[in-house]
């Protein structure tokens, strides 16, 4: 960070005349908001990112910045515009007193303002290196395609690009945006400055210890010699990548962000924009043994967020901390004692640990997948990464109890063949944030733009919930779960699938008057049932049990409690076929599961009956899990009987298309 006092001589004293002719008033009814890092030591007061509304042009951004300077000058404050953003997000970076925030928030076009904050390299010990030779035989790993069609951007420290392991593979761009190192006695030693970035470049594309040996890389320096950077520097780096992409479009791009800071709305927004421009972003979940949703860019939904596991597939412990976890993590990857290029010498290797190393593994796998199938979208790539991961190998006891259900039990792996997965119907489970405990609280889970929401379920640890429903929001279906009075809150769980040319709709049946329960089916020609949801207004559904097995010849039907409205997700897509699979247990049981067989993909997961002792239902890979209250707290055994209902689908169309390609 620039010396707070030292450069005030340089600050532009804006002229009052700048104000003339800039009398655009802020739009009525819209209040700009101020955000800052929740972690106090990471805050950088005095520097602010002013984010303008989406359609703001560069000229308007510049004019708004000048207007701020002019109004500040009238009040006797000096300001300095450090950067004007365009290409990714409209806005500007300004050095000013916090006293001016109120004024800045009232400027025209302003959407929100965020105080700058620190981001950090996510490796431990990233500068206490241990020189070691590679501990494997090079023959063992000869990937079919080394990622040669893909360019991987690395936003990190400086790197020793002529290290034997990566020479010729990494182009060092002229981009550099780093804060001053802390401490007056800091000694800048080149090999230490390059340590983190060199190691990660080696993990991604190193000749002997790299994942994607054919991938070419470009490095941007956003972390200083202590492994520290800023949100604003990272934003400007992401903007640089977007501009480079526009100037010289190349093949698929992967951006590796092996860094983390506190939750940042603006950093997440920039990642979203870049992802929507077709760039794959991979980031470290963070090394704080905490919920990854509290950190950025880990919490950005469009980013592939990677936690770290060790050689035994256990979550990595890093001193007193360890890998982050939770619903914002997409998958885990090796992140302990990872051998890679050491900047201590041109032939040295070192082992480093952390979610940075894990993210570098996934960036390498992504580069190989994209090189084999350059047309893959971000959604398709993410689904493939999940599909080919090792399932259920992580010991979940390491995670806090309330995070276990939310954290994906997936360890990244290379596909057995980088081609030929096209026939598969890919689905993943997306958990919402927790709703909070208020009576009317709801939680919403969303799929990515090019995924289809095929089913929606809900879960509450207390069991006090009012079900869930699929509803349209901004032209897209979302999954909304409802808390109940006295409940501690709910989660919405969306099943998000890749289903090309799909036409899906929701059919709803209101609560039934009759005692037989509520039913709804897919009545449109060619539409099949992909998921069932139920939602009720009453606080307790009671013990009414609808018939568990649906009548023969009516597989396209959702059945539920008579006091609940039932929602059927009905889809039409070429060659799509689905079937209902049920597993009922007569005696009370805390967990009932039912899985789809090989070749079929779980699209829907729900529970019968929807009574209050059922905590909820959710999909884990291809298994539908229904959780009930602790058996000891369940009154009668008759109420304890629970059925897990899975809807399993496959696409004959995708299978045929794949065979035709081969």
């Amino acid at each position: 960070q620039e010396d707070e006092d030292g450069d005030y001589e340089e600050l532009v004293l804006a002229l009052r005349s700048e104000e003339d002719g800039l009398a655009e008033a802020p739009e009525h009814g819209t209040t700009a908001t101020f955000h800052r890092c929740a972690k106090d030591p990471w805050r950088l007061p005095g520097t602010y990112v002013v984010v303008l509304k989406e359609e703001t042009h560069l000229s308007q951004s510049e004019r708004t910045a000048r207007r701020l300077q002019a109004q500040a000058a009238r009040r006797g404050y000096l300001t300095k515009i450090l950067h004007v953003f365009h290409g990714l997000l409209p806005g500007f970076l300004v050095k000013m007193s916090g006293d001016l925030l109120e004024l800045a928030l009232k400027l025209p076009h302003v959407d929100y303002i965020e105080e700058d904050s620190s981001v950090f390299a996510q490796s431990i010990p990233w500068n206490l290196e241990r020189i070691t030779p590679p501990r494997y035989r090079a023959d063992e790993y000869q990937p079919p395609d080394g990622g040669s069609l893909v360019e991987v951007y690395l936003l990190d420290t400086s790197i020793q690009s002529d290290h034997r392991e990566i020479e010729g593979r990494v182009m060092v761009t002229d981009f550099e945006n780093v804060p001053e190192e802390d401490g007056t006695r800091f000694h800048r030693q080149a090999s230490k400055c390059d340590s983190h970035g060199t190691h990660l470049a080696g993990v991604v594309s190193g000749r002997d210890a790299g994942v994607a040996k054919g991938a070419s890389m470009r490095s941007l320096r956003v972390l200083n010699c202590q492994g520290k950077g800023t949100v604003s520097g990272t934003l400007i780096g992401l903007e640089f990548i977007r501009k480079s992409q526009l100037v010289q479009p190349v093949g698929p791009l992967v951006v590796l962000l092996p860094l983390a800071g506190g939750y940042s709305r603006v950093l997440n927004a920039a990642c979203q924009r870049l992802a929507r421009a077709g760039v794959v972003l991979v980031t470290a979940a963070g090394n704080f043994r905490d919920d990854a949703c509290l950190y950025s860019p880990a919490s950005a939904p469009e980013v592939i967020t990677v936690g770290a596991t060790n050689a035994q597939d256990q979550p990595v412990t890093l001193g007193t901390l360890g890998t982050n976890f939770g619903r914002c993590v997409d998958l885990f990857a090796p992140g302990e004692d990872i051998i890679g290029a050491s900047s201590d010498c041109s032939t040295c290797f070192v082992s480093q640990s952390g979610t940075s190393q894990a993210a570098a593994h996934v960036a390498g796998i992504a580069a190989m997948m994209l090189s084999a199938e350059p047309e893959l979208t971000l959604a398709e790539l993410r689904q493939r990464l999940i599909h080919f991961s090792a399932k259920d190998v992580i010991n979940e006891a390491w995670f806090p109890e309330d995070q276990r259900v939310l954290t994906p039990n997936l360890v990244a792996a290379l596909p057995p063949s980088t081609h030929g997965a096209g026939w598969q119907l890919f689905c993943r489970t997306v958990w919402s944030a927790h709703s909070g405990p208020t009576r009317m609280a709801t939680a919403v889970a969303r799929c990515a733009p090019d995924e289809e929401l095929l089913s929606c379920s809900s879960f509450s640890r207390s069991g006090k919930r009012r079900g869930e429903r699929m509803e349209a929001q901004g032209g897209k279906l979302v999954c909304r779960a409802h808390n109940a009075f006295g409940g501690e809150g709910v989660y919405a769980i969306a099943r998000c699938c890749l289903l090309p040319q799909a036409n899906c709709s929701v059919h709803t049946a209101p609560p039934a008057e009759a005692s037989m329960g509520t039913r709804v089916h897919c009545h449109q020609q060619g539409h099949v049932l992909t998921g069932c949801s139920s939602h009720w207004e009453v606080e307790d559904l009671g013990t009414h049990k609808p018939p568990v097995l649906r009548p023969r010849g009516q597989p396209n039907q959702c059945v539920g409690h008579r006091e609940a409205s039932i929602h059927a997700s009905c889809c039409h897509a070429p060659g799509l076929e689905c079937k209902v699979k049920e597993h009922g247990i007569p005696a009370p049981q805390e967990q009932v599961t039912v899985a789809c067989e090989e070749g079929w993909t779980l699209t829907g997961c729900s529970a019968l009956p929807g009574t209050s002792h059922v905590l909820g239902a959710y999909a884990v890979d291809n298994t539908c899990v229904v959780r009930s209250r602790d058996v000891s707290t369940t009154g009668s055994t008759s109420e304890g009987a629970v059925t897990a209902v899975a809807i399993c689908c496959r696409s004959r169309h995708l299978a045929q298309a794949s065979q035709e390609l081969q």
Partner: antibody, heavy 115, light 109 residues
Framework: QVQLVQSGAEVKKPGASLKVSCKAS????????ISWVRQAPGQGLEWMGW????????NYAQKVQGRVTMTTDTSTSTVYMEVRSLRSDDTAVYYC????????WGQGTTVTVSS | QSALTQPASVSGSPGQSITISCTGT?????????VSWYQQHPGKPPKLMIY???NRPSGVSNRFSGSKSGNTASLTISGLQAEDEADYFC?????????FGGGTKLTVL
């Protein structure tokens, strides 16, 4: 295009010193170091060492350690190799090559050490 | 004594295929993906023909191919042509340096 251009032939007396230059062009210098390789008449290739164009770090072959110094001048994109205390068995063609991968070679500098 | 062992000479007729071997240890050829092959005509600098075991630089004929098994790397030239007559050297990384083979003289009969 990528090019490495070396200095001209040299005749030296035993005990003298030799300094060969290699000027690089056509690529991003910091992405590769420079290797030095020599070839005695009718013999094979011998790797002598490597220097980083990025930070000046060196990696010398054990056989020549202490007698060889490699340096770089980034302002002129030129790398130098100095050999001290020349002996008759230092008679060889000296090549510079790009990086450890040695994908591009200089034209060679013939060095004769003779009394 | 070179660190990597190559046959001193091989020969073949035009159109034939020949293979040159390069044997090292687990500390060089067997331990790294970075085996290279160079062609050298008399009075000329070496030219890179194969890098990282089996990759061909652009501009090198696809008649040249490389492979590796254990501690031995091989260069195969198919459809021999008169201009292939030259010396061929293999090289490999070691933990801290580079080593070359002694060279193989290829004669096209």
């Amino acid at each position: 295009q990528v090019q490495l251009v070396q200095s001209g032939a040299e005749v030296k007396k035993p005990g003298a010193s030799l300094k060969v230059s290699c000027k690089a062009s056509g690529y991003s210098l910091t992405s590769y170091g420079i290797s030095w390789v020599r070839q005695a008449p009718g013999q094979g290739l011998e790797w002598m060492g490597w220097i980083s164009a990025y930070n000046g770090n060196t990696n010398y072959a054990q056989k020549v350690q202490g007698r060889v110094t490699m340096t770089t001048d980034t302002s002129t994109s030129t790398v130098y190799m100095e050999v001290r205390s020349l002996r008759s068995d230092d008679t060889a063609v000296y090549y510079c090559a790009r990086g450890y991968g040695m994908d591009v070679w200089g034209q060679g500098t013939t060095v004769t050490v003779s009394s | 004594q070179s660190a990597l062992t190559q046959p001193a000479s091989v020969s073949g007729s035009p159109g034939q295929s020949i293979t040159i071997s390069c044997t090292g240890t687990s500390s060089d050829v067997g331990g790294y993906n970075s085996v290279s092959w160079y062609q050298q005509h008399p009075g000329k600098p070496p030219k890179l023909m194969i890098y990282e075991v089996s990759n061909r630089p652009s501009g090198v004929s696809n008649r040249f191919s490389g492979s590796k098994s254990g501690n031995t790397a091989s260069l195969t030239i198919s459809g021999l042509q008169a201009e292939d007559e030259a010396d061929y050297f293999c090289s490999s990384y070691t933990s801290t340096s580079m080593v070359f083979g002694g060279g193989t003289k290829l004669t096209v009969l």
